[in-house]
Interface confidence: low
């Protein structure tokens, strides 16, 4: 069976939207009105991995683009990147681990933990207009909580 996917946008706990910042980078900033059209629409695919009531493995692709968020080591540090894939082969049920995030729901907020690097989360800065990154701390200065808005396909 084909992998189940849904289209959505994400906003951080400060209500910052995620937008493209160059071909392989996302950043977070407050958008209003028509500018909201600039926010990235994700294709969230439900993939194979460890699952529980509040933890669901997903892959986050960019709608209509052959790009997926992935987690890799750079200079010995877990790093978030946008990775190009062959659209003929993706999405798939058994995604490579670097593409997999554990979607964790807590108090109506979502966290996205890297399956490759446990306890590392998709994060944004408090500051406006800064890159989305992989952070190793929760509850600190950086933001790891998101809300999801469904987008009709």
């Amino acid at each position: 069976a084909p992998v189940r996917s849904l289209h959505c946008t994400l906003r951080d706990a400060q209500l910052k939207s995620l937008v493209m910042s160059g071909p392989y980078e996302l950043k977070a900033l407050h958008l209003q009105g028509q500018d909201l059209e600039q926010q990235v629409v994700f294709s969230m695919s439900f993939v194979q991995g460890e699952e529980s009531n509040d933890k669901i493995p997903v892959a986050l692709g960019l709608k209509a683009k052959n790009l997926y968020l992935s987690c890799v080591l750079k200079d010995d540090k877990p790093t978030l990147q946008l990775e190009s894939v062959d659209p003929k082969n993706y999405p798939k049920k058994k995604m490579e681990k670097r593409f997999v995030f554990n979607k964790i729901e807590i108090n109506n907020k979502l966290e996205f933990e890297s399956a490759q690097f446990p306890n590392w989360y998709i994060s944004t800065s408090q500051a406006e207009n800064m890159p989305v990154f992989l952070g190793g701390t929760r509850g600190g200065q950086d933001i790891t909580d998101f809300t999801m808005q469904f987008v009709s396909s």
């Epitope: 937008v19 493209m20 160059g22 209003q32 028509q34 500018d35 890159p131």
Partner: antibody, heavy 121, light 112 residues
Framework: DVQLVESGGGLVQPGGSRKLSCAAS????????MHWVRQAPEKGLEWVAY????????HYADTVKGRFTISRDNPKNTLFLQMTSLRSEDTAMYYC??????????????WGQGTSVTVSS | DIVMSQSPSSLAVSTGEKVTMSCKSS????????????LAWYQQKPGQSPKLLIY???TRESGVPDRFTGSGSGTDFTLTIGSVQAEDLAVYYC????????FGGGTKLEIK
Amino acid sequence: DVQLVESGGGLVQPGGSRKLSCAASGFTFSSFGMHWVRQAPEKGLEWVAYISIGSYTVHYADTVKGRFTISRDNPKNTLFLQMTSLRSEDTAMYYCVRDDYDVTDYTMDYWGQGTSVTVSS
Amino acid sequence: DIVMSQSPSSLAVSTGEKVTMSCKSSQSLLNSRTRKNYLAWYQQKPGQSPKLLIYWASTRESGVPDRFTGSGSGTDFTLTIGSVQAEDLAVYYCKQTYNFPTFGGGTKLEIK
């Protein structure tokens, strides 16, 4: 082909006003942030102002803040720069410039040919 | 504001020669999270509007000849033209895009 055509330049008295226009074609205007950049005679380039796709984010250089207003009309594919309280140091070629990555990366990939503004009595 | 300084202000070379020009910023343009330097180079030929050559310090814009190379990180950057051609006669500007853009004063390249 991307085309940006500026108009509205000319001779203005000090303290006067002028409105520049930029007609865009060859790309989806409403999907790109836009800038005005100026160049005084025999001088370097100076960024003037930026406007986001839906006009909700605007930024100005300190030298023009409070005097210049950037705006856009997406259905008409046109960018504007309203200039007031003009000074001699505003004399320059004014370029309309497209922003490469839509939100505020300020990588300017296409430039118009410019329109010349001279502030003099 | 971030201040950009370019040197030399002008230089004259023969065609076929290699040329380098420098750009220094008053603060680092390296974003440690993205590992990108937010610096671009533009070429302005006489009587023309500027043209984007390089962004992120070293990424060549599509269609730009590979004799143009950008390098550097942090506060010190270099534009190198591997083998100067007559059509490279121009003023070259660096520009930081780390925050509101500021340009360097330019380096004028003349052909002997």
